[in-house]
């Protein structure tokens, strides 16, 4: 019987922010409740001279009025006692985009090909997650090697999120576009 309490989930041991920096393409995602990036999601992680990690991300968002915009998002990460668990503050470059604070866990990565990210926004009384999101990232926009695909599926099962992900298309929709020149 799988333990689905969030406190039992394993994360990447000895996570290295510097090795994680660079471009990651989101290949699959499990959505939370509400507004969220839809597709064409590309994130760029970096670490400054003080060791703080930050990220910018671009992706297509469908607003409540059914407008599609390419959103530019920014996030800063505060370290915790676990090197793979961060407190993330995020906001959209445009004022109408979402902002907030989430946990941001790096569940697993090999730094060179794949990464699995997880965030639980709301806990149930029994310690399981009531509202979560998760991304599968690849260094290559064409996808993941078969062995990486398998370990990713295993991690999805360990997060109690098997079969809850959907693939993310990368069709160039946001290449050279942003919300500033679409509205």
């Amino acid at each position: 019987e799988r333990d689905c309490r969030v406190s039992s989930f394993r994360v990447k041991e000895n996570f290295d922010k510097a090795r994680f920096s660079g471009t990651w393409y989101a290949m699959a995602k499990k959505d939370p409740e509400g507004l969220f990036l839809q597709d064409n999601i590309v994130a760029e992680f970096s670490v400054d001279e003080t060791g703080q990690m930050s990220a910018t991300a671009k992706g297509r968002v469908r607003l409540l009025n059914n407008w599609d915009v390419c959103a530019d998002m920014v996030g800063t990460f505060t370290d915790t006692e676990d090197p793979a668990k961060f407190k993330m503050k995020y906001w959209g470059v445009a004022s109408f985009l979402q902002k907030g604070n989430d946990d941001h866990w790096i569940v697993d990565t090999d730094y060179d090909t794949y990464a699995v990210q997880y965030s639980c926004r709301l806990l149930n009384l029994d310690g399981t997650c009531a509202d979560s999101y998760s991304f599968v990232f690849s260094r290559d926009p064409n996808g993941l090697p078969p062995e990486a695909q398998k370990i990713v599926r295993q991690r999805q099962e360990e997060l109690c999120l098997a079969r809850q992900y959907r693939l993310i298309v990368h069709n160039g929709y946001c290449d050279g576009r942003s919300e500033r020149n679409l509205l």
Epitope: D108, D110, Y111, D112, T113, S138, D140, P145, E147, K150
Partner: antibody
Framework: QVQLQQPGAELVRPGTSVKLSCKAS????????MNWVKQRPDQGLEWIGR????????HYTQYFRDKAMLTVDKSSSTAYMQLSSLTSEDSAVYYC??????????????WGQGTSVTVSS | DIVLTQSPASLAVSLGQRATVSCRAS??????????MHWYRQKPGQPPKLLIY???NLESGIPVRFTGSGSGTDFTLTINPVEADDVATYYC?????????FGGGTKLEIK
């Protein structure tokens, strides 16, 4: 530290079977594949097949599909290879070797010391 | 199956000099942004030991005298400078597709 423990030697009769073991320690067994590699005296390395420690998915090279059967026991973190219908051609050293995506190598990063199988009447 | 052809089959190099081993694949072993070619060293009576993974990445604990290069179908292992401890047989191996395959090996001796 990662270790793959194999028995040193097996002496078996022609026409019989032998089951080789490879006990893993020092890592999460279900995160990796176990490969098996054959080496005849003064010869090169020949890949037999691999098995996923998580769900027992297997891949074999064509010749060994009828010769070798790979299994795992997750509870003891042990991989097994059964070789059947043994002939003198099966006399060799058999290595187990770990591989996987977790650390990004996609190569066989740890090897057992090998089991020397001698087929003789 | 992907056939890996190593050359030369054997070579003799003076201490302190450079040794170069070549491995050619019958088809590309490059996919998803990486070349899935690896190099191993085997000394007599011992199991193989990983030296280089994914064409050019030095395995932890391996001296920087060992370098791997190449992509697609043509790969090279270079040892510079060669030391007495390097006497061994060197193998390339691909993991781009099943069945995994090894090259025939290159035996390095000291001149």
């Amino acid at each position: 530290q990662v270790q793959l423990q194999q028995p040193g030697a097996e002496l078996v009769r022609p026409g019989t079977s032998v089951k080789l073991s490879c006990k893993a320690s020092g890592y999460r067994f279900t995160d990796y594949w176990m490969n098996w590699v054959k080496q005849r005296p003064d010869q090169g390395l020949e890949w037999i097949g691999r098995i996923d420690g998580y769900d027992s998915e297997t891949h074999y090279t064509q010749y060994f599909r009828d010769k070798a059967m790979l299994t795992v026991d997750k509870s003891s973190s042990t991989a097994y290879m059964q070789l059947s219908s043994l002939t003198s051609e099966d006399s060799a050293v058999y290595y187990c070797a770990r591989s996987g995506a977790v650390e990004g190598r996609y190569s066989m990063d740890y090897w057992g010391q090998g089991t020397s199988v001698t087929v003789s009447s | 199956d992907i056939v890996l052809t190593q050359s030369p089959a054997s070579l003799a190099v003076s201490l302190g000099q450079r040794a170069t081993v070549s491995c050619r694949a019958s088809e590309s072993v490059h996919s998803y942004g990486h070349s899935f070619m690896h190099w191993y060293r085997q000394k007599p009576g011992q199991p193989p030991k990983l030296l280089i993974y994914r064409a050019s990445n030095l395995e932890s604990g391996i001296p920087v005298r060992f370098t791997g290069s190449g992509s697609g179908t043509d790969f090279t292992l270079t040892i510079n400078p060669v030391e007495a401890d390097d006497v061994a047989t060197y193998y390339c191996q691909q993991s781009n597709e099943d069945p995994r395959t090894f090259g025939g090996g290159t035996k390095l001796e000291i001149k």
